[in-house]
């Protein structure tokens, strides 16, 4: 599946568009908003009733090379007494992001866009219980 | 940019870093994964910090549709199904990369853009301070 072309219902293709070879697209990887700083709630991953840890994955042939993944610390959730309650479930929350993959074929290099599923954090859910006959 | 290991037999002229502009195949690897969080799980309803999902659409962006989470309550749902305001429903936010059409409206010319999305909510036990 390909990235959808611009629908004519929205707008006409401007004359100023750069020429692009068929089957490919031009991508500027100078990131817009690269330097914006996010004021994330501090220690949310430790204070959550479904706490999680972070792991950094590194791949030099990917842009960005660093992707952070979360892993739930427990199967159950932490109750008011600080104990794990296994009648509840800690579950991962996931989000897709795009990365650019660099591929080497001999001495030539090609670039491919890739969707990556990132685990962002965890939430505590009430399990759906089925009694098996 | 980031350093790329190079095949020793290749000419030295190749830049070790990612170039600023690249030509990319139009086919996206893993494109067909399910992007509608409502269909992928019902965690948003079953969580102790449930959330609503709002559709954010922008034809100048790929993906054009992004789902934003908004926590349904200030507090968290307790075992009795009531909101416990001694706990907090807090959005889990993540920076993701999307494609922005640049120049605008061009079908095959993009720039990477970093955006902040709320993906879901989690229940947090706050540390309490009594202000003198």
């Amino acid at each position: 599946r390909k990235i959808p072309k611009v629908g004519h219902t929205f707008f006409q293709k401007p004359e100023s568009c750069p020429p692009v070879p068929g089957g490919s697209m031009k991508l500027d990887i100078g990131i817009i908003n690269e330097n914006q700083r996010v004021s994330m709630s501090r220690n949310i991953e430790s204070r959550s009733t479904s706490p999680w840890n972070y792991t950094v994955t590194w791949d030099p042939n990917r842009y960005p090379s660093e992707v952070v993944q979360a892993q739930c610390r427990n199967l159950g959730c932490i109750n008011a007494q600080g104990k794990e309650d296994i009648s509840m479930n800690s579950v991962p929350i996931q989000q897709e992001t795009l990365v650019v993959r660099r591929k080497h074929q001999g001495c030539s290099v090609s670039f491919q866009l890739e969707k990556v599923l990132v685990t962002v954090g965890c939430t505590c859910v009430t399990p759906v219980i089925h009694h098996v006959q | 940019g980031i350093t790329i290991p190079r095949n020793p037999g290749c000419p030295n002229s190749e830049d070790k870093n990612f170039p600023r502009t690249v030509m990319v195949n139009l086919n996206i690897h893993n494109r067909n994964t399910n992007t509608n969080p409502k269909r992928s799980s019902d965690y948003y309803n079953r969580s102790t910090s449930p959330w609503n999902l709002h559709r954010n659409e922008d034809p100048e962006r790929y993906p054009s549709v992004i789902w934003e989470a908004k926590c349904r309550h200030l507090g968290c749902i307790n075992a009795d199904g009531n909101v416990d305001y001694h706990m907090n429903s807090v959005p889990i936010q993540q920076e993701i990369l999307v494609l922005r059409r640049e120049p605008p409206h061009c079908p095959n010319s993009f720039r990477l853009e970093k955006i902040l999305v709320s993906v879901g909510c989690t229940c947090v036990t706050p540390i309490v301070h009594h202000v003198a």
Partner: nanobody, 116 residues
Framework: EVQLVESGGGSVQPGDSLRLSCAAS????????FGWFRQTPGKEREFVAG????????EYANSVKGRFTISRDNSKNTVDLQMNSLRPEDTAVYYC?????????WGQGTLVTVSS
Amino acid sequence: EVQLVESGGGSVQPGDSLRLSCAASGRANSINWFGWFRQTPGKEREFVAGIRWSDAYTEYANSVKGRFTISRDNSKNTVDLQMNSLRPEDTAVYYCVLDLSTVRYWGQGTLVTVSS
């Protein structure tokens, strides 16, 4: 350090109105929500009303819905609680609460008395 200054408490008759205010100063950034709890002698503190900072979403206890209105002023880091049609059972110490997601600050409280 965060400071909370509450004002507006006092004695009124049933059916009257009162407006409570709370101003936050100091390192009150990344506010999650701002609101009010209340407590009567021998009882637990109960949630009255709260307003989420990011989108002004409001929540109320069932006992005050339709009578109390919470509002905020982002530029001044203040929150107001407009209390109308007050009843004797609204008599309590009202505490301002500033919530920063993982940390919560409680004010010292202001007394509201409703009696004829």
